[in-house]
């Protein structure tokens, strides 16, 4: 004959544990039913009656099988620099993540507690490391032969155009200006190419000179929510 299935509440056999979705109630000394996600325990079990569960009320939740007396409160509404990627429901907490152009400066178990705007590299500086969901942009000065004339959290240092005849030589924040003869592009030393589109101009190709072996003077600025460092702007 098959063994009798015990219905909650029941006293467990000595040395055995309660079954899945049950808990041992110390007061009743019985195995009792847990409440499902979206519920909480309204009345705890006794020797003769099982747990009475109730719905999680507005803006509260439980994500797991439980016997908590009250559901957990959902986090506060997402701030203006965030987007709600998961709504508050009776079975899950609200999750806020940073909107585009921002990164998470202070994370929490799920989602983000504090978002900060991505650092913008000012003219003469380009993006050395792009921002991610959880890290800020790292700027670096444009190496000789490269420039950036924008204030941007995405633009890298681009190579100066190579002129047959230079009208105005380029610097870290300005491209070279050529006389009327057609310019060509060079991969100058220290030019960084990040995996993102870079605006190109129509140009004649010409063999590029061998890169110089001179050491690069570029450096990385610290990551994280630090005050605007050299080469970056908080705007």
């Amino acid at each position: 004959l098959p063994a009798q299935v015990a219905f909650t509440p029941y006293a467990p056999e000595p040395g055995s544990t309660c079954r899945l979705r049950e808990y041992y109630d110390q007061t009743a000394q019985m195995c009792c039913s847990k409440c499902s996600p979206g519920q909480h325990a309204k009345v705890f079990c006794t020797k003769t009656s099982d747990t009475v569960c109730d719905s999680c009320e507005d803006s509260t939740y439980t994500q797991l099988w439980n016997w908590v007396p009250e559901c957990l409160s959902c986090g506060s509404r997402c701030s203006s620099d965030q987007v709600e990627t998961q709504a508050c429901t009776r079975e899950q907490n609200r999750i806020c993540t940073c909107r585009p152009g921002w990164y998470c400066a202070l994370s929490k178990q799920e989602g983000c507690r504090l978002c900060a705007p991505l650092r913008k590299c000012r003219p003469g500086f380009g993006v050395a490391r792009p921002g991610t969901e959880t890290s800020d942009v790292v700027c670096k000065p444009c190496a000789p032969g490269t420039f950036s004339n924008t204030t941007s959290s995405t633009d890298i240092c681009r190579p100066h155009q190579i002129c047959n005849v230079v009208a105005i030589p380029g610097n870290a924040s300005m491209d070279a200006v050529c006389t009327s003869t057609s310019p060509t592009r060079s991969m100058a030393p220290g030019a960084v190419h990040l995996p993102q589109p870079v605006s190109t101009r129509s140009q004649h190709t010409q063999p590029t000179p061998e890169p110089s072996t001179a050491p690069s003077t570029s450096f990385l600025l610290p990551m994280g929510p630090s005050p605007p460092a050299e080469g970056s702007t908080g705007d």
Epitope: C35, S36, P37, G38, Q39, K42, C53, D54, S55, E57, D58, S59, A87, C88, T89, R90, E91
Partner: antibody, heavy 118, light 106 residues
Amino acid sequence: QVQLKESGAALVKPGASVKMSCKASGYTFTDHWVSWVRQSHGRSLEWIGEISPNYDTTNFNEKFRGRATLTVDKSTSTASMELSRLTSEDSAIYYCSRTNSGWYFDFWGPGTMVTVSS
Amino acid sequence: NIVMTQSPTTTAASPGEKVTITCLASSSVRNIYWYQQKSGASPKPLIYSTSSLASGVPDRFSGSGSGTSYSLTINTMEAEDAATYYCQQWSRNPPTFGSGTKLEIK
């Protein structure tokens, strides 16, 4: 599209029980709790209870605990409610509704008319 | 149980007129939900979480309020808005509904 189809009207005697069903379609049945709400003639709405097809757990309005039995059949995406010890006060339209993942009822069935009369 | 008191019980409005229905809770609630029920039909959600419009609801409907006092506003009444409106809370179990406001067209 989400649809909730309820069983037909019932005429029952006082003291008896009535069982009604609600077949869901157009969404994943186990993703939402199913609630039962009644509306007595010309009166407001009254929540009876709800069941989770996913967890097979129930919540009740204390007024109906012990008198209402909620069940689900996942294989046919059908929720059922049995109400026992009926009195004339139980004459009403009984609606099944899908409880939104939050705290309101976003889709409703057409209702089942229950008349309790000797 | 939280008691939801709606006012007015019945009202009538001309097309184009602004209509406001209020709902008072017997104790503070976090949110309110509004439903529209036309004669012989099932209730249909209008507003959820106090002020968010349910799917397919025209933007002439809006909701506001906090604590114990909430309201539903129809900015410009249309003939199809003639119905009974109910508020509902679920800040305390069990969820409870208001007694309804019947809105007629003049």
